[in-house]
């Protein structure tokens, strides 16, 4: 397992731009994955979205998300994943241990894992982007 060098925290605007890009890429990944018919999402897998020990806007759990996406890449090498990982790397600010992920061995269960994590990643990025872009808006109807 490797660790990344410590970087300065990014300002909110920078994070927002990266998350916007990730949100777009996550939709591309999900669309690609959803082309596989007859696969249902599973309740057995949960992608961590936020880091428990960081403050907004730098609290997206990029190391864990990256580890899950690397696992998907091993199971089914989607070209968009490399680009996603590249962007996630920009959001990693300190040394982080690699997240250990139990990979299903059954072929169908692998497909469920890929679909579930891809869907949760897309939803995580949407929620993260909303939390970043809504802070400055007025609470009006």
């Amino acid at each position: 397992s490797h660790t990344l060098p410590v970087r300065l925290l990014r300002p909110s605007d920078d994070v927002q731009k990266i998350v916007e890009e990730l949100q777009s890429l996550s939709k591309m990944l999900l669309k690609d994955v959803e082309e596989e018919k007859g696969v249902l999402v599973s309740q057995n897998y949960t992608l961590p979205c936020l880091s428990p020990d960081a403050q907004p806007p730098n609290n997206i759990h990029s190391p864990a998300i990256r580890a899950y996406l690397k696992t998907i890449r091993q199971l089914d090498n989607k070209s968009v994943i490399d680009e996603i990982i590249e962007h996630l790397d920009k959001l990693i600010f300190q040394d982080a241990p690699e997240t250990n992920i139990s990979v299903p061995t059954d072929t169908h269960e692998c497909k469920r894992f890929i679909l579930t994590i891809s869907q949760q990643f897309s939803e995580c990025m949407d929620l993260a982007l909303k939390s970043l872009t809504s802070g400055a808006q007025q609470a009006t109807t």
């Epitope: 979205c49 949407d126 929620l127 808006q137």
Partner: nanobody
Framework: EVQLVESGGGLVQPGGSLRLSCAAS????????MGWFRQAPGKEREYVGG????????YNSESMKGRFTISRDNAKNTLYLQMNSLRAEDTAVYYC???????????WGQGTQVTVSS
């Protein structure tokens, strides 16, 4: 256009619980990503957490994740925020918000006041 109405706020003692509701009308509730925010007097609005249309939940902090639970009932067009072990610093106006995928929260409720005091 979606209308959102919060309810369930009030005065509660430290350590107590409250369950906030957000009733939605005027749109297809099940297709919206929903969120909770709060604003304490003299402070910026703070994100509490959100829930996707499929029920994937994200909280703003581990502290909130431990004490707060966000859920939704698509059949009742209602979003919930269950708050346990309330503290004085949780005193704020709580707002719910709705938005479609890929957009900010476009629709907001008027808020419900939560006061935690002995």
């Amino acid at each position: 256009e979606v209308q959102l109405v919060e309810s369930g706020g009030g005065l509660v003692q430290p350590g107590g619980s409250l369950r906030l509701s957000c009733a939605a009308s005027g749109g297809t509730f099940s297709s919206y990503t929903m969120g909770w925010f709060r604003q304490a007097p003299g402070k910026e609005r703070e994100y509490v957490g959100g829930i996707s249309s499929s029920g994937y939940v994200m909280y703003n902090s581990e502290s909130m994740k431990g004490r707060f639970t966000i859920s939704r009932d698509n059949a009742k067009n209602t979003l919930y925020l269950q708050m346990n072990s309330l503290r004085a610093e949780d005193t704020a106006v709580y707002y719910c918000a709705a938005g479609t995928i890929g957009r900010p929260y476009d629709y907001w409720g008027q808020g419900t006041q939560v006061t935690v005091s002995s």
